[in-house]
């Protein structure tokens, strides 16, 4: 028996662009709380008990109200640890799901409203009694920093909390073959911890830290299959526990990767690339099933009835990602044509069109000159989304209604004098200069 402890250090916007300012607002104050779900990291774990190792809910954190203009801080967190007691042996490898929830404290009818802000999941190897392990996980634009450990509750001790420490005064109950371990003479040592990474399927150990292979397997962690056909030479090295040690055609022969994983050889053994929903050395573990509710934003979870089958989230319009966790930036596809401004309203897209264009995507080019008259003999020129008048000499302005002073722009160079004329302008050039604008 023992307790898994989780300490949340910070929750806030992650690095990089697009990070949210805050889950709360000046109009809608809120506070955070966390939920942790633990599962033993074994592929056969039943799906009907999604948190088979246990679950815990934190207290509510302090109320937070965003200050407009202030930089986005890490959000105030609940006090204390999240503690998940476990009754049996600590499994050593476990899956976790940590959810960050927001409690909105506005004027909701019927009390506060809760919504899931972020969910992170992972699989870790952890010995009970060890130091705190630190971790950083990102969920969308959010970042969660936390530490965790597993500790045994007296009288249990050991990396799995399966050894019982008895008082020295109690008579020894160590069975044959179980040696007492120092410093308590009456403490019985039962389970062996094999070498870290020793294949759970093809390895075994008689001594702590050992990794011996079943016949047909080799390598330091018993992950490499042996081809006995390559041992025809009597001089070929062989062993009682490993069979023939000469490696066969390759460690990926027979594809050791489960659940549709693809195998690639590495210098020392092999590596599995797992399909969505699976992980582990051989893709044998599915950490999250539909029972865990992995689909955000109203996504529909299908498949994944048990940990050996991957789940798939069917996302509602406007969301994407394997867990429907990403809002689709539909404006990034630039659906508004002719320079229209795109507005994503969540439930719909709206285009705000420039003058001279219309339609849901600003696809219609309006006749800019329709119903437009240019005064004083000017002619209408269509284009650029707005009508323009080409005015007769002596007139200007949008509709050629203003009498133009052709000398206002001082068109005569080198000190030439400008005179307005009915047909335009005339430059009287200074001595030594010539040309229509005295430019020579």
């Amino acid at each position: 028996a023992g307790v898994f402890e989780l300490q949340i250090h910070s929750f806030g916007p992650g690095p990089g662009p697009g990070a949210p300012r805050s889950p709360c607002s000046a109009r809608l104050p809120c506070r955070l709380f966390f939920r942790v779900c633990l599962k033993p990291g074994l592929s056969e774990e039943a799906a009907e008990s999604p948190c088979a190792l246990g679950a815990a809910l934190s207290a509510r954190g302090p109320v937070y109200t965003e200050q407009p203009g202030a930089p986005a801080p890490d959000l105030p967190l609940p006090d204390g640890l999240l503690q998940v007691p476990f009754r049996d042996a600590w499994p050593g490898t476990f899956s976790f799901i940590i959810e960050t929830w927001r409690e909105e404290l506005g004027d909701q009818i019927g009390g506060p409203a809760w919504s899931l802000l972020a969910r992170v999941a992972g699989r870790r190897r952890l010995a009970a009694g060890g130091p705190w392990a630190r971790d950083i996980q990102r969920a969308g634009a959010w970042e969660l920093r936390f530490s965790y450990r597993a500790r045994c509750e007296p009288p249990a001790v050991g990396t799995a909390c399966t050894r019982l420490c008895r008082p020295r005064s109690a008579p020894s109950r160590c069975g044959p073959g179980l040696r007492p371990c120092a410093p308590l003479e009456d403490e019985c040592e039962a389970p062996l911890v094999c070498r870290a990474g020793c294949s759970p399927e093809h390895g075994f150990c008689e001594q702590p830290g050992e990794c011996r292979c079943l016949e047909g397997w080799t390598g330091p962690l018993c992950t490499v299959p042996v081809s006995t056909s390559s041992c025809l030479s009597p001089r070929g090295p062989s062993s009682a526990t490993t069979g023939c040690l000469v490696p066969g055609p390759g460690p990926c022969d027979g594809n050791p990767c489960a659940n549709g994983g693809s195998c690639s050889e590495t210098p020392r053994s092999f590596e599995c690339t797992c399909p969505r929903g699976f992980y582990g050395l051989r893709c044998e573990v599915s950490g999250v099933t539909c029972a865990d509710g992995p689909c955000f934003n109203g996504g529909l979870c299908v498949g994944g009835a048990d940990p050996d089958s991957a789940y798939i989230c069917h996302c509602p319009p406007g969301f994407q990602g394997s867990n429907c966790e990403k809002r689709v930036d539909r404006c990034s596809l630039q659906p508004c044509r002719n320079g229209g401004l795109c507005l994503d309203l969540g439930h719909a897209l709206r285009c705000r069109c420039r003058a001279g264009f219309a339609g849901p995507r600003c696809e219609h080019d309006l006749d800019d000159c329709a119903g437009r008259a240019c005064a004083n003999g000017g002619t209408c020129v269509e284009g650029g989304g707005a009508h323009r008048c080409s005015c007769a000499l002596g007139f200007g302005g949008r509709d050629c209604r203003e009498r133009a002073d052709p000398c206002a722009a001082r068109p005569c160079a080198h000190g030439g004098r400008c005179y307005a004329h009915f047909s335009g302008l005339v430059c009287a050039c200074a001595p030594g200069y010539m040309g229509a604008r005295c430019e020579f």
């Epitope: 074994l42 592929s43 056969e44 499994p91 050593g92 190897r125 389970p191 062996l192 759970p200």
Partner: nanobody, 116 residues
Framework: QVQLAESGGGSVQAGGSLRLSCAAS????????LGWFRQAPGKEREEVAI????????HYRSSVKGRFTISQDNAKNTVYLQMNSLKPEDTAMYYC?????????WGQGTQVTVSS
């Protein structure tokens, strides 16, 4: 606490049969495998037969294939080893073992002696 208790060992003439039983208790998580190992005097411990508890698939040492059969009774949490056509070289201490993630558990063993 995981406990494995073997029974069914004994002495038999070459060509005879024995059935070993291993009763497992004290755990709630499914093991990776349950199996039978043996160790003859002066030799290394070696696996005889393994049953993968999730899938029910089996693994046999090449020298016992066709003679020994491993099976499990999930309701009783017991694994069996049916040994037929026994040979003198099968003489050894037979141990029941269980693998849970990185942990190995062993029973106390039961002696099998095959005389010619």
């Amino acid at each position: 606490q995981v406990q494995l208790a073997e029974s069914g060992g004994g002495s038999v003439q070459a060509g005879g049969s024995l059935r070993l039983s291993c009763a497992a208790s004290g755990y709630t998580y499914t093991s990776n495998w349950l199996g039978w190992f043996r160790q003859a005097p002066g030799k290394e411990r070696e696996e005889v037969a393994i049953i993968y508890t999730g899938s029910g698939s089996t693994h046999y040492r090449s020298s016992v294939k066709g003679r020994f059969t491993i099976s499990q009774d999930n309701a009783k949490n017991t694994v069996y080893l049916q040994m037929n056509s026994l040979k003198p070289e099968d003489t050894a201490m037979y141990y029941c073992a269980a693998r849970f993630s990185e942990y190995n558990y062993w029973g106390q063993g039961t002696q099998v002696t095959v005389s010619s």
